[in-house]
Structure formats: structure tokens, C-alpha cells
């Protein structure tokens, strides 16, 4: 008789999940000399240990501490780029501006980027059929808790001027319920971080509005100011041109507003 399996609302674990995590770890440590000391088999064992045999709605940050310890990484604290609902452009930016880092440019962020995973209570099996959805099932699921944990640590490490890319095409440009709004904003350290600079990315070609005046941006400014961190905001009217000018800053068209 087959054992009854919990049917969750979200997609199941990404195919070849263990192999992908291990392979990404090996690739990352080969490319980044400062992480060559990392033992990728131990990283996988710690990752697996965080969720295997545990109820996928009862995962805690504590479960991920062994993995966090193994993946400890020093990134230049004044070169951090946060993002909310605009991952693609943020990653395209750091691919060009190689001295800046998103969370997914770190070892732990890269390991889990685009992946889904969960286990089952009391069995060593990985659930490839379904995993809990944050909204429909539970928030303390393996994926959500992982990103909450690494995002908090990433924000805590930031210093000087921290940049955040926000999606100007969304109804809530700043969303208090996003990882940025609920975790990262509250874990920037006022004694280390001088300024949070928001880059609001415009979607439409003809959109010339000053989205820095948007009520949700004002809300962000208020939260940040109350935490004794300065706030500044820039409109990026032409994201395509913005990237082009990051690639070729000497281009004559790059002196005008983008």
C-alpha cells in the first residue's frame, strides 16, 4: 500500500536538485578563488540537513545555520545591490558592473537561485511532486525560510551606500510584503549604512513621470529615515540605455539622463 503523501499547492522540488546544488557549488568555488576552501559535499550535506525528514511547514532559520556557516562569504559591503520584483535587470547589471553584488552573486544565493525544494516529515525522501506555497499553504517552508535567512544576513553585511533596484511598472513600487520590504529594509544596520539609494526602473518608453514621488516610495523613505539612514532616489527612465551606459560609460549619449 503506497504511503499517503501530502499534496501541496506549489510546484515540487526542481528535478536533479541535489546534483544541481553540488554542481553549482563546485562551479562557484572554481570561479571564485576566495571560496576555494569550501567543501561542496559538506555544503550539500548541510543544505539537505536543513529540510530532509522535517515537516515542510515547520522549517526555521535555525535549521539553515550549519549551511550559513559553511557558506560564509565576505563581499565588499559598500558594493551591495538589493532588488525587488526586478531580478533580471539587477542580475544583468551585476554581470556588467562586476564589482557590485546581488544576493544571487554570492555562493548561497547562486546555489538556490530559481530552485524549489522540500522534504517530508519522518522520511529521507525529497518531494518532487509538490511543495508548500507561501500563500496557500504556509510561510515557514524550506524555500521561503532559506531566502529570508540569506536575505537578512546579506542586508546585515551592507555598509556605506546601499543600492536597491525597484520595479516602476508595478502597482506597489515598494511593497512592504516583499523580501526587500519585510526583511532587508529592517536589517540594514544604521551604524554601518549611511544611505539607501533606490533606483526606480521605468517600464514604458514614454513614461516620464517622477516615480520617486510615488506614495510607496515615500513610505520607504519614511521607514528608512526612522531607522536613521539617509534615503535618495533616482528614476531610470531607459533601462536599456542604462545597461548600455554601464557597459560603455564613455559613450557620448551617456551624459544625458537615463
Amino acid at each position: 500500500v503506497p504511503r499517503w503523501r501530502q499534496q501541496w499547492s506549489g510546484p515540487g522540488t526542481t528535478k536533479r536538485f541535489p546534483e544541481t546544488v553540488l554542481a553549482r557549488c563546485v562551479k562557484y568555488t572554481e570561479i571564485h578563488p576566495e571560496m576555494r576552501h569550501v567543501d561542496c559535499q559538506s555544503v550539500w550535506d548541510a543544505f539537505k540537513g536543513a529540510f530532509i525528514s522535517k515537516h515542510p511547514c515547520n522549517i526555521t532559520e535555525e535549521d539553515y545555520q550549519p549551511l550559513m556557516k559553511l557558506g560564509t562569504q565576505t563581499v565588499p559591503c559598500n558594493k551591495i545591490l538589493l532588488w525587488s520584483r526586478i531580478k533580471d535587470l539587477a542580475h544583468q547589471f551585476t554581470q556588467v558592473q562586476r564589482d557590485m553584488f546581488t544576493l544571487e552573486d554570492t555562493l548561497l544565493g547562486y546555489l538556490a537561485d530559481d530552485l524549489t525544494w522540500c522534504g517530508e516529515f519522518n522520511t529521507s525522501k525529497i518531494n518532487y511532486q509538490s511543495c508548500p506555497d507561501w500563500r496557500k499553504d504556509c510561510s515557514n517552508n524550506p524555500v521561503s525560510v532559506f531566502w529570508k535567512t540569506v536575505s537578512r544576513r546579506f542586508a546585515e553585511a551592507a555598509c556605506d551606500v546601499v543600492h536597491v533596484m525597484l520595479n516602476g511598472s508595478r502597482s506597489k513600487i515598494f511593497d512592504k510584503n516583499s523580501t526587500f520590504g519585510s526583511v532587508e529594509v529592517h536589517n540594514l544596520q544604521p551604524e554601518k549604512v549611511q544611505t539607501l539609494e533606490a533606483w526606480v526602473i521605468h517600464g514604458g518608453r514614454e513614461d516620464s513621470r517622477d516615480l520617486c514621488q510615488d506614495p510607496t516610495i515615500k513610505e520607504l523613505e519614511s521607514i528608512i529615515s526612522k531607522r536613521n539612514i539617509q534615503f535618495s532616489c533616482k528614476n531610470i527612465y531607459r533601462p536599456d540605455k542604462f545597461l548600455q551606459c554601464v557597459k560603455n560609460p564613455e559613450d557620448s549619449s551617456c551624459t544625458s539622463e537615463i
Partner: antibody, heavy 126, light 107 residues
């Protein structure tokens, strides 16, 4: 959801060049290989080559070496393929297809293709 | 280049039948083999990867087995929507190569 959208049909004369595009969405573009596969009318599938968008390195089937160039634009999540010196036997449907996670593929030698574009019909005729 | 040989090249069967298609590699490829289904005018669709792993969303009547040089795709009980052409592909090394295809037709 993961999607690959290819450029429209083309009619070309022998000797001309062909430029095809494949725009990806729904996943982290630089984390996966992109393959090109073609299929002549009534024939089987033929692998042409692959590009790694993380860095742009390419590998081509020997048959197409020197006549094909694959490039990528990470700012638009688009992969391009140029085929030069077209001949009538280049008449085919050209598919782009997403490969495995590139770290996984290289580590385990596992180069399958899980998502395909809709195909671009190319006719080469004088 | 690794040569992939599929058999049979065509096959007639009825709804409900159990069908097996075989694929042989000219040299060992471990379990790096994929199976695709293609319908006329459509792009191929991945069914099986790593010789025996079922791609997400593919019905469980499809299964794959084998390693090294000999592989099989089995459809346990044919459904009307399964009539199509099936290709194996070695996923072990460049250049990637496909079998010539097996056309599965209604008897």
C-alpha cells in the same frame, strides 16, 4: 512560466545570410545553456550547436563550424544564430531549446533540452 | 561523434497496447540519454531524461530504462494522443546526436 519565443519565418536566396533570434523568459537566463537544433522537411532532428549565456562560450557541430555563429545578449535575454552562405539544403525548421543548468550539465555531462521554442521556418530558394 | 540507432523506424499499434522503442549508442554514454515526443508541425517535447527519469508533467505510462549503450522507451498503455514520432538523444558529450526517429502510427 519558462518560455522561448523565436523570430518569424524567413525566405532566403542561396549565398545569403540568416539571422535568427530566440528570446527567453521565466528563468535566470545565464544559468542555462541554449541549443540550436534544426529539422529539414520530413527528416529527423539535427543538433547545430550550443551557447553558454554566462560568458558566451560556444560549441558547434563540425558540419556547421565556420558557417554558423551563436551570440547572446544578456540585457534582453536573447540568443542569436547567424548562418552564412546559405544553400538549398539549409531549408528547415530551426529550433532553439533550453539546456540543463550549465553547472549541472558540465559537472555531470548531462546535455538534454527541456524547453523548446516554437521553431522558425526557413526556406532557401532561388 | 556518437551514433544513435533507433528501432523500429516505424510502428503500428492500437490504443491500449504496450509499446517499446529501443535506442542503441555506438559507444557507452552511461545514463545520459533523453527521449522526446514530436507531433507534426510542433516542437519536440522532453519525456525522459537521465535514461529513466520522467520529466515533470509527463504521464506515468511513459517510462525509460537502460544504461551504457542500450536503452528503451516504453508506453504501458497507448492513448490516442501518443501517436507521434519519438527521438532518443545522447546527452553525454558534444556533438549531441539524435536517433533517426520512430514514427508511431495507429493500426
Amino acid at each position: 512560466q519558462v518560455q522561448l519565443v523565436q523570430s518569424g519565418s524567413e525566405v532566403k536566396k542561396p549565398g545569403a545570410s540568416l539571422h535568427l533570434s530566440c528570446k527567453a523568459s521565466g528563468y535566470t537566463f545565464i544559468n542555462h545553456y541554449m541549443h540550436w537544433v534544426r529539422q529539414a522537411p520530413g527528416q529527423g532532428l539535427e543538433w547545430m550547436g550550443v551557447i553558454n549565456p554566462r560568458g558566451g562560450s560556444t560549441t558547434y557541430a563540425q558540419k556547421f563550424q565556420g558557417r554558423v555563429a551563436m551570440t547572446t545578449d544578456t540585457s534582453t535575454y536573447t540568443v542569436y544564430m547567424e548562418v552564412n552562405s546559405l544553400r538549398s539544403d539549409d531549408t528547415a525548421v530551426y529550433f532553439c531549446a533550453r539546456g540543463s543548468d550549465n553547472a549541472l550539465a558540465d559537472y555531470y555531462n548531462s546535455y538534454d533540452m527541456d524547453v523548446w521554442g516554437q521553431g522558425t521556418t526557413v526556406t532557401v530558394s532561388s | 561523434a556518437i551514433r544513435m540507432t533507433q528501432s523500429p523506424s516505424s510502428l503500428s499499434a492500437s490504443v491500449g497496447d504496450r509499446v517499446t522503442i529501443t535506442c542503441r549508442a555506438s559507444q557507452g554514454i552511461s545514463s545520459a540519454l533523453a527521449w522526446y515526443q514530436q507531433k507534426p508541425g510542433k516542437a519536440p517535447k522532453l519525456l525522459i531524461y537521465d535514461a529513466s527519469s520522467l520529466e515533470s508533467g509527463v504521464p506515468s505510462r511513459f517510462s525509460g530504462s537502460g544504461s551504457g549503450t542500450d536503452f528503451t522507451l516504453t508506453i504501458s498503455s497507448l492513448q490516442p494522443e501518443d501517436f507521434a514520432t519519438y527521438y532518443c538523444q545522447q546527452a553525454n558529450s558534444f556533438p549531441l546526436t539524435f536517433g533517426q526517429g520512430t514514427k508511431l502510427e495507429i493500426k
